[in-house]
Amino acid sequence: EPTMYGEILSPNYPQAYPSEVEKSWDIEVPEGYGIHLYFTHLDIELSENCAYDSVQIISGDTEEGRLCGQRSSNNPHSPIVEEFQVPYNKLQVIFKSDFSNEERFTGFAAYYVATDINECTDFVDVPCSHFCNNFIGGYFCSCPPEYFLHDDMKNCGVNCSGDVFTALIGEIASPNYPKPYPENSRCEYQIRLEKGFQVVVTLRREDFDVEAADSAGNCLDSLVFVAGDRQFGPYCGHGFPGPLNIETKSNALDIIFQTDLTGQKKGWKLRYHGDPMPCPKEDTPNSVWEPAKAKYVFRDVVQITCLDGFEVVEGRVGATSFYSTCQSNGKWSNSKLKCQPVDCGIPESIENGKVEDPESTLFGSVIRYTCEEPYYYMENGGGGEYHCAGNGSWVNEVLGPELPKCVPVCGVPREPFEEKQRIIGGSDADIKNFPWQVFFDNPWAGGALINEYWVLTAAHVVEGNREPTMYVGSTSVQTSRLAKSKMLTPEHVFIHPGWKLLEVPEGRTNFDNDIALVRLKDPVKMGPTVSPICLPGTSSDYNLMDGDLGLISGWGRTEKRDRAVRLKAARLPVAPLRKCKEVKVEKPTADAEAYVFTPNMICAGGEKGMDSCKGDSGGAFAVQDPNDKTKFYAAGLVSWGPQCGTYGLYTRVKNYVDWIMKTMQENSTPRED
């Protein structure tokens, strides 16, 4: 506990102190006081530097003195033989004696008292920045007029902080400008403008004079500008060293002016104004800005339009332009939006064709559609090459965005028919020779595939069964073969309006207009064993002449069987109609004269007994296309005959092309259009 005074005596005082003693006393007086220590008696064995016995006075880390020997007072009016004055409130006294004393020494008597210290004068470091006032036990600092004492109660400064400037234009100067600014001050000025405006500070070099930096380059007095996380400065010296125009990019600016105790200069003066916040003219690739300006500021709106082939993708929606606004933070709205190359996406697949997986689906990429050759070809032209256009569509030079259409190649058998081993009236055939051949199981008959959805046959085949079951792709009509082949399901049967329906079809003598179309429920897939026959053209090139050869095929009656199991075929010449008229009807159901012969009928056969017969009805009489020798067209359909193995009559298909086309068009699915 600190005391104001006290007494310190050597061990056994006033008797002789013992050998080998070390004793210490810690003196403490209250804060704000110094210590006056004085000795009234001193009798300690003398030695050089008091090495044997001594009394040592220590203040902090400093030895204030070391005493030994005998002392007496120089002043008859004072008993003090030695004294110490320290400006601190703590002191340590240490007494030491060695192992022997040659004489009897009595030691020492000392006293300490708390004394006032003058903090204002007693120390090298002046405690107050301006005025120091001493009092017993302490001191206080005070300031000149217009200065105030800081919280540390030692430093005085000018009350130059707290000003907030909100006007869009203004002037700020250091205190007393142009007179010397106050020392030891920290002045803080705040500029707070409306959002969207940036503070722009302008200074003139001559309006700035602040104590220069030290040898290490550190400003002793400094002016600093802080805008958000950006700092300009510190600045000091004669003449403003920074940019004379500071664009802060912020609507809030703090100006901090810090001074030390020495070297006051005239200070500084600045002007500021609020500029609408500029937004950078960003380089947005593949786009055009409207309006185009050298500088864009707060609230400016631009329309950014993508160049052709580029688009803005936001979510799932693609657009060709977007608006961007210069915001209060100096950043553009919608800045994440970019003009990216248009992506046309994975190209749509097409029926009976393919498109190679593109390396890229972006603007400018090229893809190629191909049809499944040799069974399909590209009907609507355009070469199949599409490029990714600016509107995000795959576009062809000819078709535009319309997809290519792969349609069946007609009239081209995979293997040509060759008359092999002679079978009376015909030869064994393979379905690949007649891939258009359709088998009807009830009644047992034939038909001709003319496209994916349509089968052409004789009217008398379907008049009694409007839901016929048909098969394609098989040479044999044995059940196990048909089970493996393609069964066709009819959607509707269209019999030519000129075909006369009879109550007793068996007694028919008029086979005029013996033609019908069967619309299929599902499209037929073409291949080596299934592919359509062409229809005749309407030009005179397709008018048949006597002697023109045609091929017939079917599973009709042969010499050995009522029905053939495997496909048979024969090559027959066209004959004059009279040849057919001249043949006696085998099993007449009426007078010979009752049988009708019309220009809608073709007569063919008569050579080597080759003819069609019961069960071949509806099959095609296939003739080589006069304009394309690689193709066959259906010149006729097996209709009727006076006698098997002689001449046969065939429906002249050329006369019905208009009806066929009209019927197919009127009954096509939307997918075909």
Epitope: F439, T469, T475, Q478, T479, S480, A483, K560, R561, V565
Partner: antibody, heavy 119, light 107 residues
């Protein structure tokens, strides 16, 4: 109309083989697909196999694979079915049957040949 | 191989009864199923082919229906000549297989 005439009844010992013939008349064998079906006494019908002229291969039911051989002699329009390693359960009437057309499974049936396997 | 499960194995009925026999395939056979009638000591006779097509010469009291895996043979009014064993057979591709048979006997 096609007619099928089969060889007569046979009695065989277990482990032996039997060869049943089937003569076609009214048609040629090349135009037909011949199937073989058997029926054990008081039991159901069992399909054994066929010759597929389109593929030129013989197809056997899994049960008879390795034991049955079906052959054809087109010059005599005769089909044959040989079954080896006979067991008592092979006792049955064996039919040759022509495959039907246009969805009918079987067309003409032979009169059947009874094969008895007994020790 | 495709398995054919025919039911019932035996059916007792009277003349004039409506009789239904069922055949189930272990996998889809589309419509490739036929029904045969067999009398003792005789070769089987085709009644129905392609699930529902009536063979010519077969009385119209016989009818077939179904596709895929479930098929039925119906005799609308049983006649004395109809007491026999009936078999279904599947034939969409090799191998062909018969059902176990259904014996229709007089009640």
């Amino acid at each position: 109309q096609v007619q099928l005439v089969q060889s007569g009844a046979e009695v065989k010992k277990p482990g032996a083989s039997v060869k049943v013939s089937c003569k076609v008349s009214g048609d040629t064998l090349t135009e037909l697909s011949m199937h073989w079906v058997r029926q054990a006494p008081g039991k159901g019908l069992e399909w054994m196999g066929t010759f597929d002229p389109e593929e030129g291969e013989t197809i056997y039911a899994q049960k008879f694979q390795g034991r049955v051989t079906m052959t054809e002699d087109t010059s005599t329009d005769t089909a044959y079915m040989e079954l080896s390693s006979l067991r008592s359960e092979d006792t049955a009437v064996y039919y040759c049957v022509t495959e039907g057309e246009a969805g009918r499974p079987f067309d003409a049936w032979g009169q059947g040949t009874l094969v008895t396997v007994s020790s | 191989d495709i398995q054919m499960t025919q039911s019932p194995s035996t059916l007792s009925a009277s003349v004039g009864d409506r009789v239904t026999i069922t055949c189930r395939a272990s996998q889809s056979i589309s419509s490739w199923l036929a029904w045969y009638q067999q009398k003792p000591g005789k070769a089987p006779k085709l009644l129905i082919y392609k699930a529902s097509s009536l063979e010519s010469g077969v009385p119209s009291r016989f009818s077939g229906s179904g596709s895929g895996t479930e098929f039925t043979l119906t005799i609308s009014s049983l006649q004395p000549d109809d007491f026999a064993t009936y078999y279904c057979v599947q034939y969409p591709s090799y191998s062909w297989t018969f059902g176990q048979g259904t014996k229709v006997e007089i009640k």
